[in-house]
């Protein structure tokens, strides 16, 4: 659930979401619209269409929870719980790393930006 | 070859704890991905998952009976223990311990080996 | 949790006949497994992951479905067929079983 990423998202990238993420450009954060503002925003957008299809698939995506190690900068989901959970781990890692593959671009400016100036196509999963 | 039996009280009264052991071979519980449940039937019915553990005494549960439930191991003397506390006549049944397949993809969660089960009579 | 409905709860089939055992599920699932078991003794493995049948099992049988819609397929009924079958998922947690099915034979 949303406990397993904050706590994934600050170990690989070694920042506090709650003040660096959650809400960070159009797409981190709940919910999400328009085009992304850049790649870490492009990270969290994916991340949303990972959890949409696990919604799809009838996981209860915020209330799942998965256990997982963290050792020498690398996630290893385990692979004892649900077919839900595992898949879930998987996609919280995923954003996770690309977050931490673009802490050089990230924008200050980017952080708690007003969804209303989220404009264009959002895009497709 | 692997084997595993069940043992218990046979029968008990209501509000007394029912202490059940599955005594296994052919496999160790120290072996990476290996795990054991704890399985019930009462008569002529369906299977209910009770508990589960794992090599690593990782332990999962039933969430409708959680409260009551304990799953340990010993792993040098090859055996799972499910403790039920409070027991009412609802839980009568035939107990099952089950190993969980060794699995090559990581999402399969079935019981490749059961043993022979044993009944749990609950008296009011 | 995942709530599995099998149908039918009780059948009966002839040598020979095709039978088709079918579980359903209160949402999407991954994949299904099935346990046979016959009076008396603990059940067993018989299908894994939807459609793989498990060590022993006689070719005669076959598992299929996905999403909430899943069966178990016997393509000419044997006397040895004559058993309960569950399945099972884990999908989410909790694990849950199946209520059974009994086949029975004509």
């Known amino acids: 659930g949303i406990l397993n990423l904050n706590k994934m998202v600050k170990q690989v990238t070694g920042k506090m979401p709650i003040l660096s993420y959650w809400p960070y450009g159009c797409h981190c954060g709940l919910g999400g619209r328009g085009q992304p503002k850049d790649a870490t925003d492009w990270c969290c957008q994916t991340h949303d269409c990972c959890y949409d299809h696990l919604k799809t698939q009838g996981c209860s995506i915020y209330k799942d929870y998965y256990r997982y190690n963290f050792s020498q900068g690398n996630i290893h989901c385990s692979d004892k719980g649900s077919w839900c959970e595992q898949q879930l781990c998987a996609c919280d890692k995923e954003v996770a790393f690309c977050l931490k593959r673009n802490l050089d671009t990230y924008q200050k400016r980017l952080r708690f930006y007003w969804r209303p100036h989220c404009r264009g196509q959002t895009p497709g999963c | 070859q692997v084997t595993l039996k069940e043992s218990g009280p046979g029968i008990l009264q209501s509000s007394q704890t029912l202490s059940l052991t599955c005594s296994f071979s052919?496999?160790?519980?120290?072996?990476?991905?290996?795990?054991v449940s704890w399985i019930r039937q009462p008569s002529r019915k369906g299977l209910e998952w009770l508990a589960h553990?794992?090599?690593?005494?990782?332990?999962r549960y039933n969430p409708s009976l959680k409260s009551r439930l304990t799953i340990s191991k010993d792993t040098s003397r090859n055996q799972v223990f499910l403790r039920i506390n409070n027991v009412d006549t609802a839980d009568t049944a035939t107990y099952y311990c089950?190993?969980?397949?060794?699995?090559?993809?990581?999402?399969?969660?079935?019981?490749?080996?059961w043993g022979t089960g044993t009944t749990v009579t609950v008296s009011s | 949790q995942i709530v599995l409905t099998q149908s039918p709860a009780i059948m009966s089939a002839f040598p020979g006949e095709k039978v088709t055992i079918s579980c359903s599920a209160s949402?999407?699932?991954?994949?299904m497994y099935w346990y046979q078991q016959k009076p008396g003794s603990s059940p067993k493995p018989w299908i894994y992951?939807?459609?793989n049948l498990a060590s022993g099992v006689p070719a005669r049988f076959s598992g299929s479905g996905s999403g909430t819609s899943y069966s178990l397929t016997i393509s000419s009924m044997e006397a040895e067929d004559a058993a309960t079958y569950y399945c099972?998922?884990?999908?989410?947690?909790?694990?849950?079983f199946g209520a059974g099915t009994k086949l029975e034979l004509k």
């Open positions: 553990i794992y090599w690593d005494d990782d332990k």
């Open positions: 949402s999407s699932v991954s994949y």
């Open positions: 099972q998922q884990y999908h989410t947690y909790p694990l849950t």
């Open positions: 992951r939807t459609s």
């Open positions: 052919g496999f160790s519980l120290s072996t990476s991905r290996m795990g």
């Open positions: 089950a190993r969980r397949a060794l699995y090559d993809y990581g999402a399969d969660f079935y019981f490749d080996v």
